[in-house]
Every structure is written in C-alpha cells, then in structure tokens.
C-alpha cells in the first residue's frame, strides 16, 4: 500500500497503525496517501522537525501512549487537513508555541494526561476552527486570561483532573459555542460570579471534586441550557435562593457529599425536566414542606447518608412522578403517616439504618404501586396490621436487623410474611429479639403455640384490611424477582472519544439498571 | 385449649352444593390461617385453600367450585364446594396455621346418585 | 405444581429400632434459608397431626424420638426407635408455594 513500514499495519481504507516497543522514532516510508496515522504504546520519546511531511492527507493523528517528552514546534507542518489530533497519554510538561501553527482544519484536540504545567494564549490562537479541547489530567495550576479567546468555535472543553486553584471570571468569556465545560477534580475554592455568563449555550457543567465552599447566587444565571450541573464532593454548605432559578432544562444535579445542612423551600426550582437529584452524604437534619415541589417530573431522589430526623408531612409535595425514594441511613425515629402519601408512582423507598421505632398503618397507603421496601436495621418490634396487605406489586421486602418482639401481636406479620413469601425474594429472615425465650428465632418459624400474649392493647388498623394477596389472575403465585441493587453515584465517568463509560459502584441507593439512567 | 369442630357427615347427589362448618375455640380467631384439606377414601391429602383476613387462596384445581368464608361473630369458617361429582367423595378437614398444627376431626361428603 | 414424591411406600420396623422416610420435592423449597417442608402423622379414622414443620422444627407435644432433616429438594423424617404407637401413614408436604401439595404417604407397621 505505497510503502508501508514493517513495524506498522496498514490497510486498505488508508489507515494506519504503528504499534511496540522496539519503536523509537515515526516509521518511514509512511504511504502518502493514509488519512488515519495511529502511533501507539511505543518508545518515541520525542517528534523532530516535519516526521509527516509526506503525508499531507492526514485527516486524524493518534499517537497516544507513548514515552513522548518533547516536540519540535514544526513536527505537525504540513498537515493542513488535520481534523483530530491525540497526544494523550504522552510525558509533555511544554508546548512549544505555534505548535499547532497551519493546522487550519483541526477541530479535536486531545492533550490529555500528560503532565502540562502551563497553557498560554498563544498555544491556541491559530486553532480558530477547534471543537473539542481535551486538557485534562494534567499539571495546570492556572488558567491564564485570553488562553481560549479565539477557540470561538469549541463546544467542548475539558479541563478536568488538574490543580487549578481558582478561575477567572474572563478566561471563558469568548466560549459562546461551549456546550459542555468540566473543570471536576481540581482545587477549586470558589468559582468568581460572571464565570460561565457568556456560556449561553452551556448544556453540561461538571465541577465535582473540588473544594468549592460557597455558590454565588447568580453563578448559573445565564446558562439556560444547561442540561448537566455536577457539584457533587465540594465543601458546599449552603445554597443561595436563587442560585438554581433560571435552569429551566436541567435534567440532572447532583449535590452529594458536600455539607448542606438545610434545603429551603423553592430552592431547586423551576426545573420542570429534572429527573434525578442526588444529595446523599451532606448533613441535612430536616426537610421542610415543599422543598422539592417544582420538581414534578423527578424521578430519583436521593437523600440517604445525612442526619435527617424530622420530615414536614408536606416535603415531597408535588414529586407526583417520583419512582425512587433513598433516605437510608438517616436519624429518623417517626414518620408522619401521610409523608409519603403524594409518591403515587413511587416503586422503591429505603429506609434502612434508621431509628424507626414504628410505622404509621397508612405509610403506604396511597402508594399502590411500590416494588421494593427495605427497612432493615431500625428499631421495629411490630408492625401495623395491614400495612402491606394492598400492595400487589411489591417484591422486595428487607425487615432483618429489627428488635422484633414475637408476642402474640406479631402473628398477623408473621402470617403474611408466610403466606406472600413467593414475591418477596430470599433476602435475610427477620428474627426474634425479645421475648427471651424466642431471641434468635425466625420470625416466621417461631412456635405459636408458646408465643407470649400480648401485653398491650393490639392496634386497630388504620384503613380497612385488604386481601394482601388476593385470589385474582392478576396476582400470580410466584413473581419474578427484580433485587435492587445499590447505586452510590451518578454516571460522571467520562471518555473524551465517542461515548460515556457507565462505571458505577452501586452501594448507596437500592435501583435497577434500567432505572438509575 | 385450640379446637376446630367441624360439622356432621353430608350426602349429595351430583350437581349440588355442600357447605361444611369448622368452629374455632381456643385461640384468637382472626390472627390464624384456615386451611381446607380433603382426602379421597383410602387415598392421600390434596390442599383445597386458604381464607385470612378474609383474603382467600384457593388450588386451581377448585377454581370456580370452592368458595371460604368466615364469621367472626362465631369463630366459624365455611368452605362451599358446588357442582360435586362422584369423585368429591372425600373426608373434608379444616387445619388451623400456615403449618397445618391443629386439624379439625374432618367431615365426610359423600357424592352419589 | 411442586410434586413430592415419598418413599418407601411402606415400612416395617422392629420395636425400638430406627425408621426412615424419604421425600424428595422436585423442586427446591427453600426460602429465606428455610426449608418449607412439612410432616404429618395420620393414624386410621383420626385427622392428620403436625409432627415436623420448616424441615427440622418438632411440633407442639411431639415425642423427641421424632426428627427431620435435609433442605433443598430431599428430605428425610427419622423415628429414632420406633413405638407400637407410632403405627401410621406419614406425609411430607410443601408449603413453599401454592398450591401446597402433599407426598403420596408412607405407611409404617411393626414387623
């Protein structure tokens, strides 16, 4: 194919590939038609003067993973069509100036981790038709003013993984194409108001995994189109009133691990299209009356790991969409009986590592729809007569970890236990703590027949009882088993190629795959 | 002590109806499954259903002919089986708990023209 | 359905000596790392009496001598020395899941 070098393949669709260790220096002859140069995992340490001078139909030039350290500011002269250029995975500390001079065409630029120290204005200036800029893990401790002012063009710019210490407010300010901005895992203490105000085409922010402390509150002002906002794991300890106002496409947010310790009523709104809000691992104590209620098509709310003890009976107004409901490993000790009554569509709720002492009979009594309940590890002996009996969906229910006190009041949960056990999965058995004679017991294998009387006045149920499982072709014996797994963060893995890589520990909140988006 | 007292023997012809009693003492009624079990003369035990909290789950095997129901007043559950035939000729029993742990004394039915 | 399936058919055992019947499910009846297995005693003209529920878990009043095991699908009542009133015909039963279905019995004499 024109010459092609022995430590490269090269095919037929003009592509070619150069790949091994016993490389030290671009092959020669590269054939003069390729128009994909791929040199990867190699031992070039360096690209001297003009090594693709012959190759001026490059059209995407990938040398990543290699040992290179140092460039010539020549070695990309002549390719006047390049349109993707990789030096990712390299040793770069410096970019010689007009490195990227005459490449009139290139729209991606891929500087990815390598260990840059520093950018400057003039690295950029001749890259008027660059897209993409992918900057991050590096070494860059600042971002010097004017740096992407002619990269007018760039929907993407990547700056994630790096030691920024602080931004100013002016080096975005020409970016009016920008489409997604991550700055996630740097050092960022506070981002300066009129940052992103001229981002107004901004669909993606990610600024997690800073050190970020306060929020301006016009910071998001004028990015109506943001559609991602990712500030999970800052040091954010409140939210100003107005900071999430004028986000009307926003689809997800994310605000774990931070340290809020309160959520204001009409702080996340109008936000008609998220869907997802995840605040796991803050230190909320309480959740006010309609916080959360321009949120109507919300369907994953997560709450779990804070220090909530009181819920308003009015909290989750208006989350009429809601499907997922984490407020696991909480300080809850009562639940207001009609707290979740707005969840008509809610499917799973966890409320384990709590310190319920008990459930209100009518918890769940509008909410026909829920899968899954997980309420182990609280401080349950008992629980209310019918509480599960019109739930025909459910088929997951976790009750271990609970001091269950198998009296004679226990019977009616035992009973249903027994009787509903083919849809509710093979999870954990709740046991007997008390009386003594039976600690340690199944609850469902206890001996009625020396189980203590009861030495309280039973409860009488809350709404009429049910068929808990009643004698209809629409109840089958047996249900399949959908187990919820745990999910503990929204997908923020990226690939700077083509696609995102779902890469998620699943161990805060109870979900299938299908639902965690 | 737990007892289930069950009515007297009772014989049908074929096509009718036969509802059989079982009295509950002993024990709090409502917090306890009734199971109904019958047994053909010289053969084995075939689960019919179950009524509590008057939800009831019945054998689809009786789907249709078998009906359980329950008087709280009177600690009494009743199962109704219709359209009997020849091969329903059966002792019928009542049997307290998901684990079957008290039985009623059994009733026959016996089906003939 | 799940079928049981009991052997032997019947059994003649000296006084005192040890008796063993089998079922086999065909099908798990574990749940929750519970074997829902189930065995009844019935003797001539009297209702069946619960024996052995949840695979090993005797019944209120029943003699020590009466013991279960085994979980999954195979299962085995042991009579560790067998008495002149322990003449019968025995049933394992499911109650896994609906419909709950009894082993075709197994009936012990003394030889």
């Known amino acids: 194919y024109h010459g092609c070098p022995s430590e490269c393949t090269c095919s037929r669709a003009s592509q070619v590939e150069c790949t091994g260790a016993r490389i030290v220096a671009v092959p020669t002859p590269l054939p003069w038609n390729a128009m994909s140069l791929q040199i990867l995992n190699t031992h070039i340490t360096e690209l001297n003067e003009s090594p693709f001078l012959n190759i001026s139909a490059l059209i995407a030039l990938r040398i990543e993973k290699n040992e290179l350290s140092r460039i010539t500011p020549g070695a990309f002269r002549n390719l006047g069509s390049l349109r993707y250029l990789s030096l990712a995975n390299n040793k770069l500390q410096v970019l010689p100036i007009g490195l990227f001079q005459g490449l009139d065409s290139l729209e991606s630029l891929l500087l990815s981790s390598n260990q840059l120290l520093q950018i400057q204005p003039a690295h950029f200036s001749q890259c008027s038709n660059l897209k993409e800029l992918q900057l991050h893990g590096n070494h860059l401790e600042y971002i010097p003013d004017g740096a992407f002012d002619h990269l007018v063009g760039l929907t993407k710019l990547n700056l994630g993984k790096n030691s920024l210490t602080h931004i100013s407010p002016r080096v975005f300010q020409h970016l009016g194409n920008l489409q997604v901005l991550r700055l996630y895992e740097n050092r960022l203490t506070d981002i300066p108001m009129g940052t992103f105000d001229g981002l107004v085409n901004l669909q993606e922010l990610a600024l997690q995994q800073n050190q970020i402390g306060l929020l301006s509150p016009g910071l998001f002002h004028n990015n109506h189109n943001l559609q991602r906002l990712y500030l999970s794991n800052n040091h954010i300890s409140q939210l100003p009133p107005s900071v999430f106002m004028q986000l009307p496409q926003l689809n997800r947010l994310t605000l774990f691990g931070n340290s809020l310790k309160e959520l204001s009523p009409g702080i996340f709104g109008p936000m008609p299209n998220l869907r997802e809000l995840w605040l796991y691992d803050n230190h909320i104590s309480s959740l006010p009356d309609n916080v959360f209620s321009n949120l109507r098509q919300l369907q994953v709310l997560i709450l779990s790991r804070n220090q909530i003890s009181f819920i308003s009976p009015g909290a989750f107004n208006g989350l009429t969409e809601l499907r997922e409901l984490s407020l696991h490993t909480n300080a809850l000790q009562d639940l207001d009986g009609n707290v979740f009554r707005m969840l008509a569509n809610l499917q799973n709720i966890s409320l384990q590592n709590n310190r319920l002492r008990q459930l209100p009979g009518n918890i769940f009594a509008n909410v026909n729809g829920l899968m899954a309940i997980q309420l182990q590890n609280n401080q349950l002996e008992n629980l209310p007569l019918g509480i599960f009996d019109h739930l025909g969906k459910l088929c997951e229910l976790r009750l271990y970890d609970n001091p269950w006190r198998c009296d004679s009041d226990i019977l009616p949960l035992r009973n249903w236990l027994l009787l509903n056990q083919p849809r509710l999965g093979t999870d954990t058995v709740p046991v007997c703590f008390s009386p003594a004679n039976v600690r340690g017991q199944s609850l469902i294998i206890i001996n009625v027949n020396v189980a203590v009387p009861s030495v309280h006045v039973p409860e009488v149920p809350s709404y009429p009882e049910t068929p808990w499982y009643p004698d209809t072709p629409s109840y089958p014996d047996t249900t399949s088993v959908s187990s919820t797994t745990e999910l503990t963060s929204p997908v923020e893995d990226y690939t700077d190629l083509t696609t995102i890589q779902v890469t998620d520990d699943r161990s805060v909140w109870g979900m299938t795959q299908a639902q965690s988006g | 002590q737990v007892q289930l007292v069950q009515s007297g023997a009772e014989v049908k012809k074929p096509g009718a109806s036969v509802k059989v009693s079982c009295k509950a003492s002993?024990?709090?009624?409502?917090?306890?499954?009734i199971h109904w079990v019958r047994q053909a003369p010289g053969q084995g035990l075939e689960w019919m259903g179950y009524i509590y909290n008057d939800g009831t789950k019945y054998n689809e095997r009786f789907r249709g002919r078998v009906t359980m129901t329950r008087d709280t007043s009177t600690s009494t559950v009743y199962m109704e089986l219709s359209s009997l035939r020849s091969e329903d000729t059966a002792v019928y029993y009542c049997?307290?708990?998901?684990?079957?742990?008290?039985w009623g004394q059994g009733t026959l039915v016996t089906v003939s023209s | 359905d799940i079928v049981m399936t009991q052997s032997p058919d019947s059994l003649a055992v000296s006084l005192g000596e040890r008796a063993t019947i089998n079922c086999r499910a065909s099908?798990?009846?574990?749940?929750?790392?519970?074997?829902?297995m189930n065995w009844y005693q019935q003797k001539p003209g009297q209702p069946p009496k619960l024996l052995i529920y949840?695979?090993?878990n005797q019944g209120s009043g029943v003699p020590d001598r009466f013991s279960g095991s085994g979980s999954g699908t195979d299962f085995t009542l042991t009579i560790s020395s067998l008495q002149a009133e322990d003449v019968a015909v025995y049933y394992c039963?499911?109650?896994?899941?609906?419909?709950?279905?009894f082993g075709g019995g197994t009936k012990v004499e003394i030889k």
């Open positions: 049997a307290r708990d998901y684990y079957f742990d008290y």
């Open positions: 949840a695979a090993s």
């Open positions: 002993g024990y709090t009624f409502t917090s306890f499954v």
């Open positions: 099908e798990s009846v574990d749940y929750y790392g519970i074997s829902f």
């Open positions: 039963q499911q109650s896994k899941e609906v419909p709950y279905t």
